[in-house]
Interface confidence: medium
Amino acid sequence: EVEKTACPSGKKAPEIDESLIFYKKWELEACVDAALLATQMDRVNAIPFTYEQLDVLKHKLDELYPQGYPESVIQHLGYLFLKMSPEDIRKWNVTSLETLKALLEVNKGHEMSPQVATLIDRFVKGRGQLDKDTLDTLTAFYPGYLCSLSPEELSSVPPSSIWAVRPQDLDTCDPRQLDVLYPKARLAFQNMNGSEYFVKIQSFLGGAPTEDLKALSQQNVSMDLATFMKLRTDAVLPLTVAEVQKLLGPHVEGLKAEERHRPVRDWILRQRQDDLDTLGLGLQG
C-alpha cells in the first residue's frame, strides 16, 4: 500500500506522458489523478513505466473502481494486465472480442497464466457458449486451449464452432475430450463429400465409435498409422481384418511396426491367425 502524501508544487500531472517515468512511486500516487489515468489508459503502453510504477497505476485504478474496471479501461490495460490477479479479473465483465484479443496479446508467447485462464473463463461464461469467433481467437493464441477444457466445458461448444478447430489444436486432447468433440465434428461436417469429410474429421477420430470406423472403411480413405494409433481401443477391437485393411489402404504395412503397441496389439490378439495371415505381414495373434 502506498502511503498518502501531498503532491509537490508544480508536479500535478496535467496528462499521462513520458515525464511521469521520472516520478517516484509516491509522486505518481500523489500527483496522477485516477480519473485522468482511466481516460488516458491508451497512453500508458506508449510509456516505458517500470514494473514497480505499474503497481502504483494499478492501485489508483483499484481505488477508482473498487467493484471492477469498466471495459473501456480494460481494453487499454496493456502491460498493466500482467499486474492483475485472478480475483481482480473476476470482478470484470468483458464482452468484446477486441478486448479479449488486446489482453491475450500482452501475454503472447508465454504459457497461459492464471490471469489469462480467469479472463477466458469470464469471457466464455459471459457469452454462454464457445462460439466460432471466440474459439478462433483462443486457439490462435493457445493451440492447446481446447484440450485444457473439461468434457463438461466442451459440451457447451456448438457444432458450428468446430470449423475453427485445426488439427494441432487437438494434439493434447485425451479420449474423454475427443468423445465429446467427435459427435459435434460429425454433425458439423455431415454435408461434405467422402474425401473432404475424411480430411476434416480425421483429427477428431479418437472419439469415433466402431460403427463409424466400419463406415469409413467402405470409403477408400487410406487412414495413416498415426491416426489409427489414436483410435479408441474399444472401437478398434470389433473391426475385422478386412475392415482394417480397407481402412488403412496402402498404410496397412505399418501395422507390423506397431504390433506391440495399443490398439494394434490388442486388436491382433482378437483376430484369427488365418485372417491375419491374409495381410502377409507376419503378424502373430
Epitope: 517516484k24 503502453n45 506508449a46 516505458p48 517500470t50 514497480e52 502491460y79 500482452v106 508467447g109
Partner: antibody, heavy 120, light 107 residues
Framework: EFQLQQSGPELVKPGASVKISCKAS????????MNWVKLSNGKSLEWIGV????????SYNQKFKGKATLTVDQSSSTAYMQLNSLTSEDSAVYYC?????????????WGQGTTLTVSS | DIVMTQSQKFMSTTVGDRVSITCKAS??????VAWYQQKPGQSPKLLIY???NRYTGVPDRFTGSGSGTDFILTISNMQSEDLADYFC?????????FGAGTKLELK
Amino acid sequence: EFQLQQSGPELVKPGASVKISCKASGYSFTDYNMNWVKLSNGKSLEWIGVIIPNYGTSSYNQKFKGKATLTVDQSSSTAYMQLNSLTSEDSAVYYCARWDNYYGSSLDYWGQGTTLTVSS
Amino acid sequence: DIVMTQSQKFMSTTVGDRVSITCKASQNVGTAVAWYQQKPGQSPKLLIYSASNRYTGVPDRFTGSGSGTDFILTISNMQSEDLADYFCQQYSSYPLTFGAGTKLELK
C-alpha cells in the same frame, strides 16, 4: 530462437558520431521495449535509455541526454543508437537488450555487444 | 539515482561450494531486482527477476532472495561453468541502475 544481432566494432575519431544497429529476429519486434546499456572498462553496466518500438517513444538516463539518440525502423525490426560528439570516455562495449514486462522490467535478452573505440 | 552496491568485487570459490553474492540498494526497491551472469567475451544473461523468480532455463542451483534494500544471489552447488561476473540491477525507478559486479574465481 530470439536473436539481437548488433553491428560490428567501430573505430572513430574524437568529435565524430556513430550509429550502432541492433536487428531483432525470432519475436515480434514491436511487442518489447528495447534498452541500450554501456559497459566500459573499470566501470559497471550503465543504462542509457529505452525505446518503445511500437510508438517510437523513448526515455533516457539524464547522463546520456544529448549524447545518445534512440530510434527504430519497424519495417526491418531494427533499433538504432546514435552517439555524437564522441570522446575517449565513450569508448566502451554497447549492448542492446530487450525488456520484457512479463519478467518484471528485467532485460531478458541481450545483443552480442558492439565495441566502440574513440581514438585519434 | 538508486545506487546498487555489491561490496565484494571478487569471491574465491571451489566446485561444490555454496556461494552467496550480496547486493544492497540505497533505498527501498521492493522486489524490483534482477540478477545477470556475464562470462568473458559474452553478453549478460538474465538469471533471476523480481528478486526471487528464476528465468526460463536457468538451473535450479541459482536462487534469489531478499526485498526492500538487501538482496542475495545464491549458487547452491558451484560448478566450473558458473565462473563469471554477476551483476544485480534495480528496475524500481529510473534510471535503471546496476551493481558494480562480483567476479567468481577458483581458489
